[in-house]
């Protein structure tokens, strides 16, 4: 459920990787949703320390992204998904190994908390970028 | 349609305080910042600050801090700007802007003409 | 705070090219936007995120922004585009919004 609000990104966390002046929506299912979802994302991002350099910054692009979706113009804030061809690129072909890894301890309960799951996209159920170009965000 | 409607001129003393209105309408109000820029006469703009109608936030430019108060009414989809300790240098016409979903003020109102005179 | 800097005049003749700079410190980092004020009138926002057009703006007007000087270009300067142009940028590190000193453009 997209409830929620646009405004700049003012993060430390994704402001290299997000686009310049990012307008980013802020899920207000979070009591305070700026500092839920950079939190979310420092949470992720700390374990994404010990990846593979070729893994890293793929994984820190689609991260912050996902977490800290663009804003799509018009008068009900809406968020823009990451394209699926894009999500698809990071699990398949950057980050194969490290995917495989974060799946089977998902599947073991090897994670302490949630929070690491609402870091990581379903590729499968993004929009893909051939459907309506507009519909999503490529990193 | 997408429209920002502001309330009408106003004369005040020195000393006195002004209440702009802003009434949104043909969008998500709480989806979006509502920033007030101001513009003297003959002057350029000046931005005074901005309100998260969603949660009540406010960020005021260092101008006018301690002068400034914004707050937004969700309930009629309506921002307001007030002016405390008003000088003759705060004659201005006073705009209410907001960006629906990008980053620049892509909507603003028609404009609040407030004269300070004695 | 962030200062940007506009020539206050710029004339050109109509059918010509009409370019109005604004400098900034390092201005290419952050997004530029412009405004187009007439007289009487509320601005209009002619070019976002340092060359987007908004819907009905016509492509005659483009933007360009990089080092230290973001550029608003006109071409085919119609009588119509007599006007305050302004640029504008969000200061990252205040927080705050910041326009430029504006420049006026004159159609000979």
């Known amino acids: 459920d997209n409830k929620g609000y646009c405004a700049q990104y003012r993060g430390e966390v994704c402001n290299a990787v997000l686009a310049k002046d990012a307008l980013v929506f802020l899920n207000t299912s979070y009591a305070d949703p700026e500092e839920a979802q950079e939190l979310l994302v420092h949470t992720a991002w700390n374990e994404l320390k010990v990846v593979s350099p070729v893994c890293r910054p793929a994984a820190e692009a689609l991260l912050c992204n996902h977490i800290f979706q663009e804003c799509s113009p018009g008068v009900v804030p809406t968020p823009i998904p990451i394209c699926r061809e894009y999500c698809l690129a990071v699990k398949e072909l950057f980050c194969a190994k490290e995917w495989l890894v974060m799946e089977e301890k998902t599947h073991r309960g090897l994670y302490r908390s949630e929070m690491h799951l609402l870091s990581v996209p379903e590729c499968s159920k993004l929009p893909s970028m051939h459907w309506d170009p507009t519909a999503c965000a490529r990193l | 349609q997408v429209q920002l409607v502001q309330s009408g001129a106003e004369v005040k003393k020195p000393g006195a305080s002004v209440k702009v209105s802003c009434k949104a309408s043909?969008?998500?109000?709480?989806?979006?910042?509502m920033h007030w820029v101001r513009q003297a006469p003959g002057q350029g703009l000046e931005w005074m600050g901005w309100?998260?109608?969603?949660?009540?936030?406010?960020n005021y430019a260092q101008k006018f801090q301690g002068r400034v108060t914004m707050t937004r009414d969700t309930s009629i989809s309506t921002a307001y700007m007030e002016l405390t300790r008003l000088r003759s240098d705060d004659t201005a016409v006073y705009y209410c802007?907001?960006?629906?979903?990008?980053?620049?003020?892509?909507?603003w109102g028609q404009g609040t003409m407030v004269t300070v005179s004695s | 705070s962030y200062v940007l800097t506009q020539p206050p005049s710029v004339s050109v003749a109509p059918g010509q090219t009409a370019r109005i700079t604004c400098g900034g410190n390092?201005?290419?980092?952050?997004?530029v936007h412009w405004y187009q004020q007439k007289p009487g009138q509320a601005p209009v926002l002619v070019v976002y995120d340092d060359s987007d057009r908004p819907s009905g703006i016509p492509e005659r007007f483009s933007g360009s922004n990089s080092g230290n000087t973001a550029t608003l270009t006109i071409s085919r300067v119609e009588a119509g585009d007599e006007a305050d142009y302004y640029c504008?940028?969000?200061?990252?590190?205040?927080?705050?919004?910041?326009f430029g000193t504006g420049t006026k453009v004159t159609v000979l």
């Open positions: 309100i998260n109608p969603n949660s009540g936030g406010t």
């Open positions: 043909g969008y998500t109000f709480t989806g979006y910042y």
């Open positions: 504008q940028v969000w200061d990252r590190s205040s927080d705050h919004y910041v």
């Open positions: 390092n201005i290419g980092s952050k997004s």
């Open positions: 802007a907001s960006g629906l979903g990008i980053s620049a003020f892509d909507i």
